[in-house]
Amino acid sequence: MAVTACQGLGFVVSLIGIAGIIAATCMDQWSTQDLYNNPVTAVFNYQGLWRSCVRESSGFTECRGYFTLLGLPAMLQAVRALMIVGIVLGAIGLLVSIFALKCIRIGSMEDSAKANMTLTSGIMFIVSGLCAIAGVSVFANMLVTNFWMSTANMYTGMGGMVQTVQTRYTFGAALFVGWVAGGLTLIGGVMMCIACRGLAPEETNYKAVSYHASGHSVAYKPGGFKASTGFGSNTKNKKIYDGGARTEDEVQSYPSKHDYV
């Protein structure tokens, strides 16, 4: 039950996170005009990954797309790439995790397969979240650098007669949306990985049972070889001579493939 809840919660948190990453990527307010020096500007500038906008005090808003690809800063291209990779990984992760959900039955899919898929989607969510956080952080760093550079040479002009003021930009709403969304996706991914441990089928152990076939006195002991699904501790199919009888403590003490999570 706890496993299902963890998996379900991980899925929902990741879903919200990825929706947030998509929203942040599409938002125009990655950077907004710093109004510290001029709070009564008649035009307010803000920029996104795909276009820059100006909102006049009348409410009229005009946006212009970045129609060039080669003329854009490499950092902006990198941020775009990171966000898109994050979205793609997240989307694939969501698709995989839907089929991995314990509450959804698809044919005769085994728990081991669901565990594998849960782990895969979890890792995808983690990488997706990291991509988003990295992208937003790179952009934020770029903003901070440009902010102080434009502050240093704020006024240039002819003999101080004409002021050509460089527009300074500060953090926009999209950055905070991106950070939170990336964090949620990351958390969701971790939860999926934790859920994966619980989904991994425990070793099914049987007590030794004697089957007497008619005419032959042969004792058959099942569990001589453990079924190797890749999730058990015995991956080399070593012969078990104790008939599979173990205490509960012993079973849990064996290291699992997923104990690092």
Partner: antibody, heavy 119, light 112 residues
Framework: QVQLKESGPDLVAPSQSLSLTCSVS????????IHWVRQPPGKGLEWLVV???????TYNSGLKSRLSISKDNSKSQVLLKMNSLRTDDTAIYYC?????????????WGQGTSVTVSS | DIVMTQAAPSVPVTPGESVSISCRSS???????????LYWFLQRPGQSPQLLIY???NLASGVPDRFSGSGSGTDFTLRISRVEAGDVGVYYC?????????FGAGTKLELK
Amino acid sequence: QVQLKESGPDLVAPSQSLSLTCSVSGFSLTSYGIHWVRQPPGKGLEWLVVIWSDGRTTYNSGLKSRLSISKDNSKSQVLLKMNSLRTDDTAIYYCVRHPAFGPHAMDYWGQGTSVTVSS
Amino acid sequence: DIVMTQAAPSVPVTPGESVSISCRSSKSLLNSNGNTYLYWFLQRPGQSPQLLIYRMSNLASGVPDRFSGSGSGTDFTLRISRVEAGDVGVYYCMQYLEYPVTFGAGTKLELK
């Protein structure tokens, strides 16, 4: 067609208050901002204040303490109040339309109302 | 506040000729989005001002294409080709980048 009509007293005594009304027709105040601009006799234009379609206001900082603007969308009227009048407030007062949905600024002006501040 | 300077108080012109009226701002009106927030108005004698040019170079509706605006971030020119008697009046430039909105002192167009 688009019309803006300013109305108010012709003569006001110094230190008194002035109330001006801008009545508009041919458009709605829910889609346009209204500026007040004045022109002292034989001089240039001076911007006073603006009230936007959503009710936001911006004042000329030099006159902010003496100005107050409000509007009634249903009556299609904008009211400008100015207190502590001085003789240098003598001017023609214009109300001006500003679209909220396009790049044009101050695209239609009223005919103006002349206000004289004198004892 | 941004100061708008119209150096020439009046400009005499012969009907049918072209004339240029200049305006200068104390600060660049070129915004980072590429728009220049400079406007031109004409106030004919005894009338209210009317919008001629918005955002430095765009013609307002109903304004003949004899009028054109140009300039850099701080220096602007209103050009009138084939001047007519109806063009007489005071031409004002205005900045709308920052509050308070400010106007130039005006340049009077007079016929020779």
